[in-house]
């Protein structure tokens, strides 16, 4: 999906209002320096591409993020503020339902969510205006 035509400011508002709090809840008890951030993004569409990938794509050691509250709210925000996003996700959603039976918080998942926090921070405040 090409995130170029999303309403970035509306997505930012959704993040600041709710998603950020859910990420904090997920990460509670984890030190901010515990993980090295290896994923970065260069502009807002790229940030959303990386956020989508880390949030919804299963990775080795972390297959359960898609059912978390922050993930569901992220999906809702993208569906509302990115034209045509919902249609591209129908097949992916079916695959996720088969792949994810339960929510398990692993160290790998905590690391992944730490990366997500950095990506969201970058998305919200790109230094060069990327509208």
């Amino acid at each position: 999906y090409d995130f170029t035509n999303c309403d970035f400011e509306k997505i930012k508002a959704a993040y600041l209002s709710t998603i950020s709090k859910d990420l904090i809840t997920y990460m509670s008890g984890t030190k901010s320096t515990e993980f090295n951030n290896t994923v970065s993004c260069s502009n807002r569409p790229h940030c959303l591409t990386e956020i989508q990938s880390l949030t919804f794509n299963p990775t080795a050691g972390c297959a359960s993020l898609a059912k978390e509250m922050f993930a569901m709210k992220t999906k809702a925000a993208l569906a509302i503020w990115c034209p045509g996003y919902s249609e591209t996700q129908i097949n992916a959603t079916q695959a996720m339902k088969k792949a994810r039976k339960s929510k398990v918080t692993t160290n790998k998942c905590l690391e992944q969510v730490s990366q997500l926090q950095g990506l969201w921070r970058r998305f919200n405040r790109p230094l060069l205006k990327q509208q």
Partner: antibody
């Protein structure tokens, strides 16, 4: 503990340059925008610019764009501000500051400040 | 650039009384229903300290006698019951539009 520690006070001659450092600890330096703010005697706060350590991208206040250069050294989690062609009105306390956790655009952690005095 | 104008420039209030500082922006600092206006307190020889973020949210560790309100172009910082340690200069700051700008500051003293 999250903190920013700046280099010590500097006395410089007009026309010279100064480079102020800001060492970060207690957080993932590469993912936070780092800002620089000027506070001249008897004046208000003035934003100089910001840098994103992840890729070195910068944003400057046009007033400082020609004379201020912001850089980072990710290996030591240190941000730098170099100010060239110094003049008397550059006499001020310079602060580095970390932008908040969420990208809201406020500064939640500040360095202790570095006093730069420009005098002949 | 968005110009932030604070009023008054200085203010003297009795201990225990209410102090109110205003900040007017030359254009709206709102975006998608959120107001990107922040308030800081600065005491002599110290760096600024965040008091209020996004117009009305209390910063970490800030006493609840401090509050913020407003939207669009007009914002207010209120100290409900002035304490001796509140003597400082107070600044508003916007980040909705680059470049980031501060108000000129309001000096708060004890009457």
């Amino acid at each position: 503990e999250v903190q920013l520690v700046q280099s010590g006070a500097e006395v410089k001659k007009p026309g010279s340059s100064v480079k102020v450092s800001c060492k970060a600890s207690g957080f993932t330096f590469s993912t936070y925008n780092m800002h620089w703010v000027k506070h001249a005697p008897g004046q208000g706060l003035e934003w100089i610019g910001a840098i994103y350590p992840g890729n070195g991208e910068t944003s400057y206040n046009q007033k400082f764009k020609d004379r201020a250069t912001l850089t980072v050294d990710k290996s030591t989690s240190t941000a730098y501000m170099e100010l060239s062609s110094l003049r008397s009105e550059d006499t001020a306390v310079y602060y580095c500051a970390r932008e908040d956790d969420y990208g809201e655009g406020y500064f939640d952690v500040w360095g202790q400040g570095t006093t730069v005095t420009v005098s002949s | 650039d968005i110009v932030l104008t604070q009023s008054p420039d200085s203010l003297a209030v009795s201990l225990g009384e209410r102090a109110t500082i205003n900040c007017r922006a030359s254009e709206s600092v709102d975006n998608s229903g959120l107001s990107f206006m922040h308030w800081y307190q600065q005491k002599p020889g110290q760096p600024p300290k965040l008091l209020i973020y996004r117009a009305s949210n209390l910063g970490s560790g800030v006493p609840d006698r401090f509050s913020g309100s407003g939207s669009g172009t007009d914002f207010t910082l209120t100290i409900s019951s002035l304490q001796a340690e509140d003597v400082a200069v107070y600044y508003c700051q916007q980040i909705n539009t680059d470049p980031l700008t501060f108000g000129q500051g309001t000096k708060l003293e004890i009457k």
